[in-house]
């Protein structure tokens, strides 16, 4: 009778991440006597996955019933396959012998492929703000996949964008493999509405890549324009003064007046107007009692936004027009849009 | 269902001959290794004798150039040639089937009884 | 040849008793070890193989351990049917060899 070979027939299996293996062995002999044990790996190292004599292999199933003595079928089914279980699986014969089994002949090695999908693409932007004009970079990443070959495309509101460096982890072979991205996105004072998205191909999500976004507006900071205009007289000695704020975002703003440099009123925005692009705006107002100043007063709009330095606009009103109340201690009447008068 | 059937035992005088015979059924006779084991009144079982699926044969040194072993596959057959018996081959001779992977027995005859005697 | 004994040679229990039987080889047999049980006038039959596999039917208070040289052979739980006798055998290399027995005997 011919010596025992220890036939392998599949060179390699390519299983989905969750999914069980298969792995094909069978030998051409009944003799001699002796277990079969699988390994993962060659040598010294090599992990012991399934031994016919003895030990408790809770993920392996073997295909036949491995008891009978005229039993030639070694397969085995792996479940519940993760990336970590690639590598290349051996089918060794040994024969009875003390104090240890001899090994007798190996299979060829079956290469064990897992097919992994890639986690969902997480996107994360700039630690802070960026004002328009200004260029921003975006990261994606996504982890776990296998093989390694995969597409990432970054997207500006369904437009492609190009200027972008990705790079996939590790180099080398691996069980499992990362992707990271980076893209650099210039800003504009239309995109509080804007989106960024990060889309990822592979051959796992057979044609429906996987998708992570970023709000531009958790990035971009648009400074408002300051306006400060003088209204016809509401009643004689007193002139309204109205500071309008546009097109700012985030919301966050606060506002003070100063007459002649001192501080006349602060208030935060609260009843805003939203435009169209997502931005707001927002109208304060001041009531100048006039009779109250001998001299012009220049009256100055000052803005912090979104905890950035101050901007202001000023405006001088001419008093010198209007007859002088003696004795008045009230110099202003201060009234936000909205609120009551105070004295 | 697998079945081993002995048979071919009886009184024989010291120095004779005798065949038994073991009939297996149930099963694929000619892929298992198939073996003799013994049994004197009383005593403790001895291993005999085993035949290979390919037709290697061992035998103890008790046994060894008396007893011959041999098998028939396309009968299903397992059979012990005893020669120059003596009253020490006195026993219960049964057959197994070394019937599990690393060749443990798993199925036995009920035996056939040798006698050797003057 | 490899010896193979067995103690103790007798036992006495009772029905619901754990009882273990010993079996010690005159060299390593890696864990190729087989357990028998004959009652009288009967074949035997076969219980145990790799010191801890059950034959086919054999029900699971039977129970073997052990390596090397020294194996183990327990009946958690005694029933009447058995009160029988004991053997085990070393099969890692030829001529395969039987301990002694044990008999084991309701007391």
């Known amino acids: 009778e011919e010596e025992l070979q220890v036939i392998q027939p599949d060179k390699s299996v390519l299983v989905a991440a969750g999914e069980t293996a298969t792995l094909r062995c069978t030998a051409t002999s009944l003799i001699p006597v002796g277990p079969i044990q699988w390994f993962r790996g060659a040598g010294p190292g090599r992990e012991l996955i399934y031994n016919q004599k003895e030990g408790h292999f809770p993920r392996v199933t073997t295909v036949s019933d491995l008891t009978k003595r005229n039993n030639m079928d070694f397969s085995i089914r792996i479940g519940n396959i993760t990336p970590a279980d690639a590598g290349t699986y051996y089918c060794v014969k040994f024969r009875k012998g003390s104090p240890d089994d001899v090994e007798f002949k190996s299979g060829a090695g079956t290469e064990l492929s897992v097919r992994a999908k890639p986690s969902a693409p997480v996107v994360s932007g700039p630690a802070a703000r960026a004002t328009p004009q200004h260029t921003v970079s975006f990261t994606c990443e996504s982890h776990g996949f296998s093989p390694r070959d995969i597409t990432l495309k970054w997207f500006k509101n369904g437009n492609e964008l190009s200027d972008f460096q990705t790079n996939v982890d590790p180099v080398g072979e691996s069980v499992s493999y990362s992707i990271h991205s980076t893209a650099k996105v210039v800003l504009t004072r239309e995109d509080v509405h804007s989106q960024v998205i990060c889309e990822v191909a592979h051959v796992t999500l057979q044609g429906d890549p996987l998708r992570g976004t970023a709000n531009l507006s958790e990035t971009i900071r648009v400074p408002p324009t300051l306006e400060v205009t003088q209204q016809p007289v509401r009643a004689e000695n007193q002139v309204n003064v109205t500071c309008q704020v546009r097109k700012f975002y985030p919301q966050r703003l606060q506002l003070t007046w100063l007459e002649n440099g001192n501080v006349s009123r602060t208030e935060t925005a609260s009843t805003v107007t939203e435009n169209k692009d997502g931005t707001y705006n927002w109208m304060s107002w001041l009531l100048v009692n006039v009779s109250a100043h001998r001299d012009d007063v220049k009256l100055t709009c000052q803005v912090e936004h979104d905890g950035q330095p101050a901007v202001s606009k000023s405006h001088d009103l001419k008093v010198s027009a209007h007859p002088k109340e003696q004795g008045s201690n009230t110099a202003a009447e201060n009234t936000g849009s909205n609120e009551r008068n105070i004295y | 269902e697998v079945q081993l059937v002995e048979s071919g035992g009886g009184l024989v005088q010291p120095g004779g001959s005798l065949r038994l015979s073991c009939a297996a059924s149930g099963f694929t006779f000619s892929s298992y290794d198939m073996h003799w084991v013994r049994q004197a009144t009383g005593k403790g079982l001895e291993w005999v004798s085993v035949?290979?699926?390919?037709?290697?044969?061992y035998y103890p040194g008790s046994v060894k150039g008396r007893f011959t072993i041999s098998r028939e596959n396309a009968k299903n057959s397992l059979y012990l040639q005893m020669n120059s018996l003596r009253a020490g081959d006195t026993a219960v001779y049964y057959c197994a089937r070394g019937g599990n992977w690393d060749d443990a027995f798993d199925i036995w005859g009920q035996g056939t009884m040798v006698t050797v005697s003057s | 040849d490899i010896q193979m004994t067995q103690s103790p040679s007798s036992l006495s229990a009772s029905v619901g008793d754990r009882v273990t039987i010993t079996c010690r080889a005159s060299?390593?047999?890696?864990?190729?070890l087989a357990w028998f049980q004959q009652k009288p006038g009967k074949a035997p039959k076969s219980l145990i193989y790799?010191?801890?596999s059950l034959q086919s039917g054999v029900p699971s208070k039977f129970s073997g351990s052990g390596s090397g040289t020294d194996f183990t052979l327990t009946i958690s739980s005694l029933q009447p049917e058995d009160f029988a006798t004991y053997y085990c055998q070393q099969y890692v290399s030829y001529p395969y060899t039987f301990g002694q027995g044990t008999k084991l005997e309701i007391k």
């Open positions: 790799t010191t801890s």
């Open positions: 035949i290979g699926i390919s037709g290697d044969t």
């Open positions: 060299q390593d047999i890696n864990n190729y």
